[in-house]
Amino acid sequence: KFSKQSWGLENEALIVRCPRQGKSSYIVDWYYSQTNKSIPTQERNRVFASGQLLKFLPAEVADSGIYTCIVRSPTFNRTGYANVTIYKKQPDCNVPDYLMYSTVSGSEKNSKIYCPTIDLYNWTAPLEWFKNCQALQGSRYKAHKSFLVIDNVMTDDAGDYTCKFIHNENGANYSVTATRSFTVKDEQGFSRFPVIRAPAHNETKEVEIGENTNLTCSACFGKGAQFLATVQWQLNGNKITDFSEPRIQQEEGQNQSFSNGLACVNTVLRIADVKEEDLLLRYDCLALNLHGLRRHTIRLSRKNPIDHQSTYC
């Protein structure tokens, strides 16, 4: 549940944060999951732990694997897993999908491209930016802090953007690159306050105890590509990830669809082996975009036994 994918290129720095959070005062121990061997904290090691961070300086392909972090508060231990994959450098310019960070959308009014994961590193400006492997030049491109701003965005600005920076650790420099796709929104499109298609507000769904059930949260946000459009489930007002019940899981990722030209997003909440206590929970479907947040609540009720009784003569 508390697992995070991280990736990097060989001979570059890679810094991974423990997926379990805590206070800065909490002790964090890191282990190789396979061997349970402790990862050293001494900075002279190529791979070392530094509080909530695990540092590969530089990374090697052989570092790939699962790492366990245990955040030790004075009274409770929280365990997380970092799934690290280190890839060989590509000889050609193509950046494979598995090395890409999340796609961002821009428009004439908003064309910020953030450099992914940069906040984990000790870097100094300026950032170098490349598009489809070509260094960006010209007054239209402005590298500002940890993001790139493109003036007067046009459709042909879409593409893969790579940021490159130097991480400094105790006087030694390590290169880091990160790539994400940038798409340009259709100016014909529009964004509006989210409309939740399902569930209906204050809906009640009948379920059978012991069976599995799925709840779909589906909302539309306007027409064309959306800069921000997200749907998610909450239980009693809490994020699913904060709810310590492994039977209840929100499916990874969100499915985008276009219905009559409208941009719609849906996500499914899967409840395995429905229990009595699940009927007491409040299930909120949340739809969020730049215009605001809309919430529809659904509750579960026990299916009336009369509905599926057999009649014997």
């Epitope: 959070q21 805590g22 206070k23 800065s24 005062s25 002790i27 004075p74 009274t75 809490n238 310590s244």
Partner: antibody, heavy 120, light 111 residues
Framework: QVTLKESGPGILQPSQTLSLTCSFS??????????VGWIRQPSGKGLEWLAH???????QYNPALKSRLTISKDTSSSQVFLKSASVDTADTATYYC????????????WGQGTTLTVSS | DIVLTQSPASLAVSLGQRATISCRAS??????????MQWYQQKPGQPPKLLIY???NVESGVPARFSGSGSGTDFSLNIHPVEEDDIAMYFC?????????FGGGTKLEIK
């Protein structure tokens, strides 16, 4: 600024269930490291820690009372709840909720308290 | 459970003098080189108010006449010079182990 306010039934009869609500503002219980706890104090006596709940829904209880207590939260409405089953006259006390903030684990802000009297 | 024993149970001090309250833990409250011991002040009809956290750190807004010291199992709260406004109950509290526990309290009075 940080404020916490407790609310409860005031009076209960023995064997009834106590339901307390802590409504807070000035911080979010979705912030890493944040917690909210419950403490009670019989009149003229000392303080007893009951339970607390963390940002990531980890719950911790006083083992002496664990079988009777349930703590929960509603992050979006900034509320924490405590239920105590089958109250007794010994549960008569002022109940406080308090925030666990700071770099270490301690109660840095307290509510004014709500008084519970258990009487038949 | 970690038992916290406060002494004295009550203390009468003249204005301007020093008041010292002790708190002894039944086992160490150290965590990663830090003592997880707090001190609270409680006036009648009011909730406790944090004075000192992790043994010796004075909470923001608390007058400098309050100070805390100690490590391991032995801790003390010092108030100097004592003022009229300091009349209250004082409690120590540990957060090293669950259950978090409080001392029995010390009542500070003015001579």
């Amino acid at each position: 600024q940080v404020t916490l306010k407790e609310s409860g039934p005031g009076i209960l009869q023995p064997s009834q269930t106590l339901s307390l609500t802590c409504s807070f503002s000035g911080f979010s219980l979705s912030t890493s490291g944040m917690g909210v706890g419950w403490i009670r104090q019989p009149s003229g006596k000392g303080l007893e820690w009951l339970a607390h709940i963390w940002w990531d829904d980890v719950k911790q209880y006083n083992p002496a009372l664990k079988s009777r207590l349930t703590i929960s939260k509603d992050t979006s409405s900034s509320q924490v709840f405590l239920k105590s089953a089958s109250v007794d006259t010994a549960d008569t006390a002022t109940y406080y909720c308090a925030r666990i903030g700071g770099d270490y684990d301690y109660f840095d802000f307290w509510g004014q308290g709500t008084t519970l009297t258990v009487s038949s | 459970d970690i038992v916290l024993t406060q002494s004295p149970a009550s203390l009468a001090v003249s204005l301007g003098q020093r008041a010292t309250i002790s708190c002894r833990a039944s086992e160490s409250v150290e965590y990663s080189g830090t003592s997880l011991m707090q001190w609270y002040q409680q006036k009648p009809g009011q909730p406790p108010k944090l004075l000192i956290y992790v043994a010796s750190n004075v909470e923001s807004g608390v007058p400098a006449r309050f100070s805390g010291s100690g490590s391991g199992t032995d801790f003390s709260l010092n108030i100097h010079p004592v003022e009229e406004d300091d009349i209250a109950m004082y409690f120590c509290q540990q957060s090293r182990k669950v259950p978090w526990t409080f001392g029995g309290g010390t009542k500070l009075e003015i001579k």
